[in-house]
């Protein structure tokens, strides 16, 4: 029959060439002479000339060695024609299958692979996967079937079989317990890929396995006991730097220390913070310490990490004995600010109050007093007793020195310590009002017309406080009442001044006496300019000059 079974030809054949493969034969050759030919890629189209056919015998010829990795199968057509060129058979399919030889080594996809795994993981934990390829046939033969293995491990600690590689997938896994970053932070594996499923050609690559840090080491105080001296009253004072060692990866959360005061700080006097670079615990005073109350504190500080421990680890504790050093403390006025009521205008030498300070120090120190700031110079202070007396006229109405009835004085207490220290106190004198000011009109100069004059409204002011102010009374004296009239308007504390009789244009003195509710009288002379005009005027008009 005009049929050819698929032909298998091994690649890399040694010849001699041309090499006879198979014979094409048409049974029509009994009747006529047959000529054979082949067409298709590998015959008359690229790659041309790989195959040929003996025209008269029908022998299929191979002209050169084949390469399966280049072309694994050729599909040709066989033709049979009679002497006159007429086809005697339909074109026949010829399949030539190139069979594989193990002519390629495996090739890793990378020369160096990198991966990582946490320290302390259990055997069986996957680390990374490596891949090698082989161009040979891995389906019909083992030529391209790659088997992976670990050739060597560097270093060999704690032993030389810390990892395994899956023979067919290339997955590297941990096979032994004992991965400890603090002992071996990295392994270098020389890995092999061997074809023929492990029995053929071998190639190597490197797999670098970094061991990642886990918080499997607790920070430990070194030293564990500290002794410090701190002056009393110092706030924010560095008491001690506590040092820890931690074998975990520096500057990682597993290494960074967290400090906690766990005992001995009942008064919340101390605080501890982690130094960002050195990892030391910086113990400082949150509040001032008091030597007189407690001259020694024993603190207990615990250290952990920012990251939680991955296993149960003992917590390190440090003991810090803090000796409080006595400091000559300043005397303290009791109270720091003292309010005293005193009547203004009391005589010089009159006692105001006794204002004294206490010294916190244990030894009885002598305290002397003096006035530090007395803006008006109104007071004196006894250096021994702290007795404050009047040395000038206390004037509640003196706005240069008195604000809201209060005169403020600063006093000083100095002890006889070495060196001496000073404390200040504030004495606030609330000045009680005395009716020492009469009412005063405003303004004191007026301009008024002598015909149909407008009344002049003057405001009444009194520097004293109620009840030494309104209601006010007005009275004109020294014959001013002949031409003028004064009336108090109680509603708005004003006095209305009116011209009763005609006065020629000139300037006149109006003697106005005002008295307050406490009958404190004040005489004020009002300068009145009378103008030749009608009704309202601001300024006298210029005299009329005839033409």
């Amino acid at each position: 029959d005009w049929v050819v079974a698929p032909i298998s030809v091994p690649e890399n054949g040694k010849g001699p060439f041309p090499q006879r493969l198979n014979q094409l034969k048409s049974n029509k050759d009994r009747d006529t002479k047959i000529f054979y030919s082949i067409t298709g890629p590998g015959a008359d189209s690229p790659p041309e000339g790989v195959f040929a056919v003996e025209k008269e015998t029908g022998w299929l010829l191979l002209n050169k060695p084949l390469d399966r990795e280049e072309i694994a199968k050729y599909e040709l057509f066989g033709h049979a024609v009679s002497e006159n060129g007429a086809s005697v058979e339909d074109p026949m399919n010829i399949s030539i299958i190139v069979t594989d030889q193990n002519d390629h080594k495996p090739k890793f996809t990378q020369d160096t692979f990198r991966g990582s795994v946490l320290e302390g993981v259990l055997p069986g934990t996957s680390v990374m996967q490596v891949t090698a390829t082989d161009e040979d046939d891995a389906i019909h033969t083992y030529n391209g079937v790659v088997a992976y293995s670990i050739h060597s491990q560097e270093p060999k600690d704690p032993h030389d079989l810390m990892f395994t590689i899956h023979r067919s997938t290339g997955t590297i896994s941990v096979i032994s317990s004992g991965l400890d970053r603090e002992k071996v932070p990295e392994y270098t594996l020389t890995i092999q890929a061997t074809d023929m499923d492990g029995d053929g050609s071998t190639t190597t690559a490197v797999a670098v396995v970094e061991i990642l840090d886990a918080n499997d080491n607790a920070p430990v105080f070194d030293p564990q006991k500290y002794e410090s001296h701190v002056p009393e009253n110092a706030v924010g004072h560095e008491v001690q730097r506590l040092t820890v060692t931690d074998l975990d990866a520096p500057n990682s959360p597993a290494w960074r220390a967290t400090y906690l005061i766990v005992g001995g700080d009942d008064g919340d006097h101390f605080t501890i913070a982690t130094h960002p670079e050195s990892n030391q615990g910086i113990l400082t005073t949150r509040k001032g310490l008091d030597f007189e109350a407690k001259n020694q504190h024993t603190l207990y500080v615990e250290v952990t990490n920012e990251a939680p421990f991955v296993l149960k680890l003992p917590t390190s504790t440090a003991t810090i004995v803090v000796h409080v050093e006595d400091v000559n403390e300043a005397p303290v006025f009791v109270p720091p600010s003292k309010v005293v009521e005193v009547q203004e205008g009391i005589p010089t030498g009159e006692a105001v109050c006794v204002y004294t300070a206490k010294d916190p120090d244990k030894e009885n120190q002598k305290i002397s007093y003096r006035i530090l700031r007395d803006p008006a110079g109104w007071l004196a202070m006894d250096p021994d007793s702290g007795q404050v007396t009047v040395a000038g006229t206390l004037d509640r109405e003196d706005e240069r020195f008195v604000r809201n009835n209060i005169y403020e004085v600063m006093v000083l207490a100095v002890d006889n310590g070495s060196p001496p220290t000073t404390g200040t106190g504030t004495l606030l004198l609330t000045l009680i009002d005395v009716n020492d000011h009469g009412p005063v009109p405003e303004p004191r100069e007026i301009t008024i017309c002598n015909q149909s004059p407008e009344s002049q409204v003057l405001n009444i002011t009194d520097k004293d406080l109620s009840p030494h102010t309104s209601p006010f009374q007005a009275q004109l004296t020294d014959d001013s009442d002949i031409y003028w009239m004064a009336e108090v308007n109680e509603k708005d504390d004003t006095v209305v001044l009116s011209l009763k009789k005609f006065l020629k244009q000139d300037t006149y003195d109006v003697h106005l006496s005002l008295s307050d509710h406490g009958n404190k009288e004040q005489l004020t002379v009002i300068r009145a300019t009378v103008c030749d005009c009608h009704g309202h005027v601001e300024k006298c008009p210029d005299p009329w000059k005839g033409g």
């Epitope: 990198r114 560097e154 932070p185 020389t190 690559a205 490197v206 970094e210």
Partner: antibody
């Protein structure tokens, strides 16, 4: 002071063998990977081989199977056994210390080099 | 193997001027896990062994003057000498240590104009 001193170079016929030595001092020899690098006359640098602290090795394909790197930590000495020498192996051979012990601390960078020893392969 | 290509092969620079040498790798030298580029720069003066200048692409080796700086990431790297001095005349090499075998660039010769 870190010092590396190569010796053992010289003239050898093609196909012959030679063993180079590198004496190290001034650092903890056993703690560092050490490399061999060569430089053909008037040419650039070519890395040949490394030996890690535990004795593991790696080679450039041009010398794999012909050259063998080894170390004797007790003598602070590195060796390069060169077999089947070819004319193209003619070069100055340097030993060079890795700056780090591990890949992650940069062991591929070489911070100290010897002065080199000249190997000439010629008939 | 990773191929390292330097440019230019040689350059002449006036004293005090800036010199720039480029280095290109056939594959990335950046390891994503630690964000480090596995590249070093060396200086080799005539008759002397090479001297390490830069590692991790940009970290200056101790004792190296600060006029030398390295930059770049992935496949493209640069060595810069900010103000060339007479003593900088040398051949400069880049080297990858991302993958075995370690490979060097062909070198760049720096001369003074």
């Amino acid at each position: 002071e870190v010092q590396l001193l190569e010796s053992g170079g010289g003239l050898v016929q093609p196909g012959g063998s030679l063993r180079l030595s590198c004496a190290a001092s001034g650092f903890s020899f056993s703690s560092y990977p050490i490399n061999w690098v060569r430089q053909a006359p008037g040419k650039g640098l070519e890395w040949l081989s490394v030996i890690w602290t535990g004795g593991g090795t790696n080679y450039a394909s041009s010398v794999k199977g012909r050259f063998t790197i080894s170390r004797d930590n007790s003598k602070n000495t590195l060796y390069l056994q060169m077999n089947s020498l070819r004319a193209e192996d003619t070069a100055v051979y340097y030993c060079a210390k890795s700056r780090g012990v591990y890949d992650f601390d940069g062991r591929g960078a070489m911070d100290y080099w010897g002065q080199g020893t000249l190997v000439t392969v010629s008939s | 193997d990773i191929v390292m290509t330097q440019s230019p092969d040689s350059l002449a620079v006036s004293l005090g001027e800036r010199a720039t040498i480029n280095c290109k790798s056939s594959q990335s030298l950046l390891y994503s896990s630690n964000q480090k580029n596995y590249l070093a720069w060396y200086q080799q003066k005539p008759g002397q062994p090479p001297k390490l200048l830069i590692y991790w692409a940009s970290t200056r080796e101790s004792g190296v003057p600060d006029r030398f700086s390295g930059s770049g990431s992935g496949t493209d790297f640069t060595l810069t000498i900010s103000s060339v001095q007479a003593e900088d005349v040398a051949v400069y090499y880049c080297q990858q240590y991302y993958s075995y075998p370690y490979t060097f660039g062909q070198g760049t010769k720096l001369e003074i104009k």
